[in-house]
Interface confidence: low
């Protein structure tokens, strides 16, 4: 049982109240984290509560404001970035969201030494991406899909690319599918460590089919949004990588980095770029059939002014059991010799672990091992490697930070976080200063989150950065639900689940059950994290039991579970939710006539299929922005797990796994279907097709659309959405309003 913040004595129990839906919608019980913006080994910046930008020196204990809130306010800045030479700050305003990571903004450069904004040769607007060089104060930015370079903020810009064109050619920024499904960033350019070179990607979307949808707005006629969006099996973007010498950009111009021959022989993706030194770069490539990844280390040839990627420096990662990597192919962390590196990939037992690659992948030295997974390599120094894993006490939904001494032999391993605040903190991430001199630990739960600062040599805690005292006080009179994280063993499969129980839970009584599902490949829902959210309210106030189950296809428990869904999406994820429900019924406290399931996105797909499974287990359910057919979703994501929708590949399962194919089976359940009409990710088309199939089958259902809302259903739509879903569930479970 996961412990929550301490309860008051029973005598005071009558002063405690349940959570309300309003609490959730107002974000009353949201928590804060503290991530230092490191600028050296011992200094970091932080935006204070009153919006001053403050520099902290850990060793001297001093702090001073480098940029006042007055300056920030003068341009309505919502973000900032200090140049590495500390002479300038860019200020970001007029933030305008595009897709998940991308946004445009207006940028102003403030000269700290002169205390004024840099004028003349100002930046165009809106800018799609802007960043400082890692050394000095060069600026690279993307405007109207082209890349520009400034040697100094006040200098005129040098235009690096000229072929950028909206929805056609993207330079230095990803197109939709690369942003969402491959890079997970708003940028596609990378400075070399000392700023000598700038690498960038060019994406050619000329031949990609376009998704078009109406944006209703306030005008007489709706706008049409057009996005080059490759659905499964469609033509993909063509990617090229270039590198330009930023010292003499006009000298030879951008030089293309060659693609490995084994990759270039068929459709492929670029997956990431990692600079090793100023004259060595590492590129990762992936075949369109995403079970072969090639890591290519390339060197600058001074004599030819070109980049050479010898075959001897190509490292191949191939999966025989699924796709390459986890959600993404992992990226390398290079060691100080600038050729060997550390990387997470599957070991022979099918668990993702850290390996040290010196010459070939085949000769990789395994650094971690066991029936658990290494999840992230945070930092490699001369003598230590810091990483996170879910090893401790065999709970896959935990994250602890470990240090391996790589300077000594044999290497010794130490868990930095396992025993710090054992009950409160079981799920950590970390942020390291230069050379890992200091680091911040951010604990996400299961107790109230806390952020702390530590010495990188001794691991000693220096100070608490954020402990959420106000939140702790606010929760003192709240009857929070109880949470359990346990596992079911079914047919050699371990199903971890989180159960959220009403505050006065009594095992001898019967409760309605709501399954919350995501279930997408390489996801994890059962995590030891703190949350006060909608399902907390449903348990606290409405007396429901809520369960989250990680079935086949979910992450961090080995390849057998992860790759079980390969080429068969929509089968085992659903089976495992159903299996878990049956086990929950056997526990004796579930009212089997009042069971519901709900999910969003992939979870909407799974919940729909579960409702249409014909088991009779579910009385009702909700699908928010569901995928309804894998033929409608993005190529990069879908094909990773499903292969191609062609007859000689996997078309049959693409057809068999649609929600529409099961329309008849919705007849005996209450179904609420919800979607935003401006969903750029899971297109409204998905729900439109479900609705059409249900109408054609003459099956009654409920639906709600959110006009001009995307996949996140944010703002006022959020309030409406959760209110609407609450009413639906209360009606389904015969709970009085």
């Amino acid at each position: 049982i996961v412990l929550r913040p301490s309860r008051v004595h029973n005598s005071e129990e009558n002063t405690m109240r349940a959570l309300t839906l309003k609490d959730i919608l107002n974000g009353t019980f949201s928590y804060k984290t503290f991530f230092p913006n490191w600028i050296s080994g011992q200094e970091y910046l932080h935006q204070s509560a009153d919006n001053n930008i403050v520099l902290y020196n850990i060793e001297t204990g001093q702090s001073y404001t480098i940029l006042s809130n007055r300056t920030m306010k003068s341009v309505n800045a919502s973000n900032y970035g200090l140049s590495p030479d500390r002479q300038f700050v860019y200020l970001e305003s007029d933030y305008s969201k595009l897709w998940r990571y991308s946004y445009t903004a207006t940028y102003y450069i403030y000269d700290l030494s002169n205390g004024e904004f840099v004028r003349g040769n100002e930046l165009p607007r809106p800018i799609q991406y802007l960043c400082w060089s890692p050394v000095g104060s060069k600026l690279a930015y993307v405007y109207q899909n082209n890349i520009y370079l400034k040697q100094r903020p006040g200098d005129p810009p040098f235009q690096i690319t000229f072929n950028g064109r909206e929805n056609k050619i993207f330079n230095g920024i990803p197109d939709w599918v690369y942003e969402e499904e491959m890079l997970a960033t708003k940028y596609a350019l990378w400075w070399s460590p000392n700023g000598k070179f700038l690498a960038y990607a060019e994406f050619n979307d000329t031949d990609i089919p376009v998704i078009a949808y109406s944006y209703y707005g306030d005008e007489q006629y709706p706008r049409t949004i057009n996005i080059p969006y490759p659905k499964a099996g469609a033509k993909n973007p063509v990617v090229r990588i270039f590198i330009i010498d930023t010292t003499y950009p006009a000298y030879v111009g951008p030089q293309e980095v060659p693609v490995p021959a084994m990759i270039a022989s068929s459709d492929y993706y670029f997956s990431w770029l990692t600079w090793v030194t100023d004259e060595r770069v590492c590129l990762q490539w992936l075949k369109r059939v995403q079970n072969v990844s090639v890591l290519s280390i390339c060197d600058f040839r001074e004599d030819w002014q070109t980049w050479d990627c010898p075959k001897t420096q190509e490292h191949i990662e191939e999966s025989r059991t699924g796709w390459a990597g986890g959600f993404f192919v992992s990226t390398p962390v290079f060691s100080y010799d600038a050729i060997s590196y550390y990387k997470i990939f599957s070991d022979k037992d099918g668990y993702k672990h850290i390996h040290y690659i010196k010459d070939t992948v085949e000769n990789a030295i395994q650094i971690t091992s066991g029936k658990w997974e290494a999840i992230n390599i945070f930092r490699v120094t001369q003598d230590s490697l810091f990483y996170s894993s879910n090893e401790f006490e065999e709970y896959p939904g935990r994250r602890n930070i470990y240090r391996i001494s790589i300077g000594s032999y044999p290497p010794s391993k130490k868990c930095v976080t396992c025993h710090l605040r054992k009950e409160r903190c079981q799920y950590y991430t970390a942020s390291f200063s230069d050379y890992a001199k200091y680091y911040a630990l951010v604990c996400y739960g299961p107790g109230i989150p806390i952020s702390t600062l530590h010495d990188g040599r001794t691991d000693q805690e220096i100070k608490i950065l954020e402990e959420n005292k106000e939140l702790e006080n606010a929760l003192k009179n709240i009857q929070l639900p109880k949470e359990e994280i346990k596992k079911l063993e079914v047919d050699e499969i371990t199903l971890w689940y989180k159960m959220i129980l009403p505050p006065q839970f009594d095992r001898s009584k019967k409760y309605p059950l709501l399954i919350q599902v995501y279930g997408g490949p390489c996801s994890q829902s059962v995590r030891s994290v703190f949350a006060v959210n909608w399902i907390s309210y449903l348990a606290s106030k409405e007396g429901m039991v809520i369960a989250l189950v990680d079935g086949r296809g979910t992450a961090f428990q080995g390849d057998k579970l992860l790759y079980a869904v390969y080429r068969k999406l929509g089968v085992y994820e659903v089976e495992d939710q159903i299996t878990a429900v049956r086990k929950f019924i056997e526990m004796g406290f579930i009212d089997e006539k009042r069971i519901a399931i709900w999910g969003w996105s992939y979870g909407g797909y799974v919940s729909s299929l579960a409702l249409a499974s014909g088991t009779g287990l579910f009385k009702c359910g909700i699908a928010v922005a569901p995928v309804s057919s894998w033929e409608y979703y993005a190529s990069v994501y879908t094909e990773r797990f499903m292969g191609l929708p062609t007859k000689d590949d996997n078309l049959e399962h693409y057809k068999n796994s649609t929600v529409m194919a099961r329309a008849e089976y919705f007849r005996n359940v209450d179904y609420l279907l919800i979607h935003g009409t401006a969903d750029d990710n899971v297109h409204f088309q998905n729900s439109a097709q479900i609705a059409k199939a249900l109408v054609n089958a003459q099956v009654d259902f409920q639906a709600m659309w959110y006009s001009d809302q995307n996949h996140g259903l944010s703002g006022l739509s959020t309030n409406h959405l959760y209110t609407h879903m609450t009413h639906f569930l209360k009606q389904c479970f015969s709970l009085s309003d």
Epitope: N291, V292, R320
Partner: antibody, heavy 122, light 107 residues
Amino acid sequence: EVQLLESGGGLVQPGGSLRLSCAASGFTFSSRGMSWVRQAPGKCLEWVSFISSSGTYVYYADSVKGRFTISRDNSKNTLYLQMNSLRAEDTAVYYCARDLPRTGVYFGMDVWGQGTTVTVSS
Amino acid sequence: DIQMTQSPSSLSASVGDRVTITCRASQSIFNYLNWYQQKPGKAPKLLIYGASTLQSGVPSRFSGSGSGTDFTLTISSLQPEDFATYYCQESYSTPYTFGCGTKVEIK
């Protein structure tokens, strides 16, 4: 008809070299991984080496590592096994075999040649 | 390396008999197991891959089962053409080790 035809076997002295070839026909050679498997007289099967369809991913059994080299020429639809520093224990029938389609999950050898005999003896 | 142990090493059976051959891996190989049939002087033939998937063209009297370390090949009704040596092979990690075979002889 799918066919694999090995050649290049024969009698060789210990320490000598041989190059085996396997000519493939009836399928798209460049889209399949290929293996060499051997069987000493009256003994079990022993997997020797594997090469991926593009020729860049290669595995060897420990017993031959450093002495044998697998390669392929997709333009000639031919698989090779260069065998150096041969030993008496390398005496066997050598089969070339085709891997299951690369779109599948499993490794397995679905088509085999008739084998070529290598005898290492002084 | 993973070791593969087959049992029995030989067996005698009559036409129409149900025959079961077992194969044990020294560590879990999940379902990464293949079964081959070899007749004297001939190349092996793939019967089953992935522990239980019948290779196309193989008669349905052959079936495979098992997962982890223990696997079984079953011939539901032995036919005259089934007298041969049967090999298991792990396909989980290189070197893809074979078992040493089970010879099925006429009783």
